[in-house]
């Protein structure tokens, strides 16, 4: 089941998935001046069996300047719902992607890929948050959001990371603690 919405945006933070659940789709987007090859895949799909998961289809881009009688192929609105774009970046936490059964790793880049990736997440997907430069986490609690199915509707849990400016102060019970720890998970909410 695809998640209806994007993972939530929170102030002064970015999010990233460490691994992608089977069923996740990644749009084949090309950078400016390039387009998908004729008859090329619209998206890559994370698929797998009990022992191994991998991305089906390959994204391929070609120069828009190349003479071609076919029109540029772009997904129709129903094929490409607006999704949160995640910039390609290094992982935020040392999560071993390969150790998660039923998940795919971050797909390697393809030639002339767009600078941002558009994922279509599925129920059960978790994304992790990190404060942007110049901000710090107010405490070390869970810094993730999970796409859950509640009352037949998908919903992302509210991330509990609060990123505060360096000038701002808060009261810690003891010494200041490091950012984000994956120990607690805000996913254990009772559904009806």
């Amino acid at each position: 089941e695809l998640c209806d919405d994007d993972p939530p945006e929170i102030p002064h933070a970015t999010f990233k998935a460490m691994a992608y659940k089977e069923g996740t789709m990644l749009n084949c987007e090309c950078k400016r001046g390039f387009r998908r090859i004729k008859s090329g895949s619209l998206y890559m799909l994370c698929t797998g069996n009990s022992s191994h998961s991998s991305w089906d289809n390959q994204c391929q881009c070609t120069s828009s300047a190349t003479r071609n009688t076919t029109k540029q192929v772009t997904p129709q609105p129903e094929e490409q719902k607006e999704r949160k774009t995640t910039e390609m970046q290094s992982p935020m936490q040392p999560v071993d992607q390969a150790s998660l059964p039923g998940h795919c790793r971050e797909p390697p880049p393809w030639e002339n890929e767009a600078t941002e990736r558009i994922y279509h997440f599925v129920v059960g997907q978790m994304v992790y948050y990190q404060c942007v430069q110049g901000y710090r986490a107010l405490h070390r609690g869970p810094a993730e959001s999970v796409c859950k199915m509640t009352h037949g509707k998908t919903r992302w849990t509210q991330p509990q990371l609060i990123c505060t400016g360096e000038m701002e102060t808060s009261q810690f019970p003891g010494e200041e603690k490091p950012q984000a720890s994956p120990e607690g998970r805000p996913e254990s909410e009772t559904s009806c």
């Epitope: 945006e9 102030p11 070390r140 609060i162 505060t164 998970r185 009772t190």
Partner: antibody
Framework: EVQLVQSGAEVKKPGESLKISCKGS????????IGWVRQMPGKGLEWMGI????????KYSPSFQGQVTFSADKSTSTAYLQWSSLQASDTAMYYC?????????WGQGTLVTVSS | DIQMTQSPSTLSASVGDRVTITCRAS??????LAWYQQKPGKAPKLLIY???SLESGVPSRFSGSGSGTDFTLTISSLQAEDVAVYYC?????????FGQGTKVEIK
Amino acid sequence: EVQLVQSGAEVKKPGESLKISCKGSGYSFSNYWIGWVRQMPGKGLEWMGIISPGDSTTKYSPSFQGQVTFSADKSTSTAYLQWSSLQASDTAMYYCVRGPYYLDYWGQGTLVTVSS
Amino acid sequence: DIQMTQSPSTLSASVGDRVTITCRASQSVSGYLAWYQQKPGKAPKLLIYKTSSLESGVPSRFSGSGSGTDFTLTISSLQAEDVAVYYCQQYYSTPWTFGQGTKVEIK
């Protein structure tokens, strides 16, 4: 079902201390910030601040810093708001809320009346 | 602190009317805005978060829009049960702050 249940109404005299409570259920209490919101009689909502029950980190609104104290006991899934010396101007309805950003669940409120 | 100003303070409309409440922030809140409904004698209830995301269980006649500093809550067809005070709240910068409220009445 997610629920925040607050302690009952209180009538106090100026200078007295008070601690009101908010018990969470239906979710992992330690993993969500709990906030407090004040509503004075006939007035609007004021955000007082938040506490993380997992490690008792707090963030107070400057307007309430030093006036109140937040605490939490994760073993009983209960958050507390306390005053060491109440004033008549503390008369208000106090709500606990689940946050930290948009406030998706609210307690029923605790009415605190301070009068000599 | 970011100041939130709502208008009008009171609004009187007929059942079935389209109702609009506005909320203006003293500086940009980047879309980090929520709307709440408080019925008489009750605790507030979340209606909308992140400007336009409808909270689960909230009727679809409620919608939110806006960006930067100017935001709108719209009730497409006012119902008798919508009589309440509506508040906006920014959660871009601590301390989170609320608008002063808009009271919606039935004519």
